[in-house]
């Protein structure tokens, strides 16, 4: 009786279980009662990443420099090319099909995590005692100046956007 299901790494065709092609190879001929499945390796610019019965290999992803992309990892016959973004840019999605500039943290916010090729800048509000007076993709919140250590007194309180202003103590 012909099979209705096949083992792992096999497929059912013409009431027969045929071996799948190994990763990195495509199908050129199904098996028959007398012959095994015939496969052929993918060419240099192509890949197949699973045991398969595909008659065509997939093209490697193109990391388009016009979109700010560059190759992070070159594809093989079994793996796709992995793209990342040029410095100062990050991917717009997990599949990294295009890039956008890193976000800058506005005054009053500091950089919690610097952006990478695949993730944007993460900003955080400067807590009490810290400030940021610039729009930057790198600068963390900086602590207010400690007037006391300079033998000075606070003349103007700091905010999340400005440092304290120190001045000389009043001589009475």
């Amino acid at each position: 009786e012909p099979p209705t299901a096949c083992r792992e790494k096999q497929y059912l065709i013409n009431s027969q279980c045929c071996s799948l092609c190994q990763p990195g190879q495509k199908l050129v001929s199904d098996c028959t009662e007398f012959t095994e499945t015939e496969c052929l390796p993918c060419s240099e610019s192509e890949f197949l990443d699973t045991w398969n019965r595909e008659t065509r290999c997939h093209q490697h992803k193109y990391c388009d420099p016009n979109l700010g992309l560059q190759v992070q990892q070159k594809g093989t016959s079994e793996t796709d090319t992995i793209c990342t973004c040029e410095e100062g840019l990050h991917c717009t999605s997990e599949s990294c099909e295009s890039c956008v500039p890193h976000r800058s943290c506005l005054p009053g916010f500091g950089v919690k995590q610097i952006a990478t090729g695949v993730s944007d800048t993460i900003c955080e509000p400067c807590p009490v005692g810290f400030f940021s007076n610039v729009s930057s993709a790198f600068e963390k919140c900086r602590p207010w100046t400690s007037c006391e250590t300079k033998d000075l007194v606070v003349q103007q309180a700091g905010t999340n956007k400005t440092d304290v202003v120190c001045g000389p103590q009043d001589r009475q």
């Epitope: 190994q22 496969c39 079994e78």
Partner: antibody, heavy 121, light 113 residues
């Protein structure tokens, strides 16, 4: 024993087409694919295309627009046709049996006697 | 397309001598999943059709004498004839059978002194 016999013209006019038949014995075309290769002093051995045992074809992209490979399994014949021949298509044309060695490995283990083709008016 | 380059283009040897010829491919013929190198060698005696000697770099086709040895990996391959015989007078071609279009080297002509 395995044999591949080729038949076809020796002389082709420029811009005309070339047709060669490869008749095989000792094996079935439903079990083995068949390649076409040509050899010229200027370009050496050039793989032109293959018809796999299931009937699907792969062609060398350089010849795809003017090449056709078909077969008749019941007659054990493979038909090669190339259009628009020019002087630089002058060569010996071979059919060759495909052998599959597993792991995606293919080679040409038996060859026809070759058909010497001259393109000239 | 994968370009195959053979050297030398010709060589002359005496019977009993060891012969080596080289074949280089423009890209690796090593399949990373199964670690096989997809290179074949063919012999073409004068006036005859090519004959398959070796496939997968080093596997001799049945009936091929064991004096023919194939070796190499990646992009560099060698055919060695350990003790050349008069009947080895021929052209030798390497061919990548990694993927289509299958491509051949330009050949090495072996002459017997």
């Amino acid at each position: 024993q395995v044999q591949l016999k080729q038949s076809g013209p020796g002389l082709v006019q420029p811009s005309q087409s070339l047709s060669i038949t490869c008749t095989v014995s000792g094996f079935s075309l439903t079990t083995y694919g068949l390649h076409w290769v040509r050899q010229s002093p200027g370009k050496g051995l050039e793989w032109l295309g293959v018809i796999w045992r299931g009937g699907n074809t792969d062609y060398n992209a350089a010849f795809m627009s003017r090449l056709s490979i078909t077969k008749d399994n019941s007659k054990s014949q493979v038909f090669f046709k190339m259009n628009s021949l020019q002087a630089d298509d002058t060569a010996i044309y071979y059919c060759a049996k495909n052998s599959y060695y597993g792991n995606g490995g293919h080679a040409m283990d038996y060859w026809g006697q070759g058909t010497s083709v001259t393109v000239s008016s | 397309d994968i370009v195959m380059t053979q050297s030398p283009s010709s060589l002359a040897m005496s019977v009993g001598q060891k012969v080596t010829m080289s074949c280089k491919s423009s890209q690796s013929l090593l399949h990373s999943f199964n670690q096989k190198n997809y290179l074949a060698w063919y012999q073409q005696r004068p006036g005859q059709s090519p004959k398959l000697l070796i496939y997968f770099t080093s596997t001799r086709e049945s009936g091929v004498p064991d004096r023919f040895l194939g070796s190499g990996s990646g992009t560099d391959f060698t055919l060695t004839i350990s003790s050349v015989q008069a009947e080895d007078l021929a052209d030798y071609f390497c061919q990548q059978h990694y993927t289509t279009p299958f491509t051949f080297g330009s050949g090495t002509k072996l002459e017997i002194k």
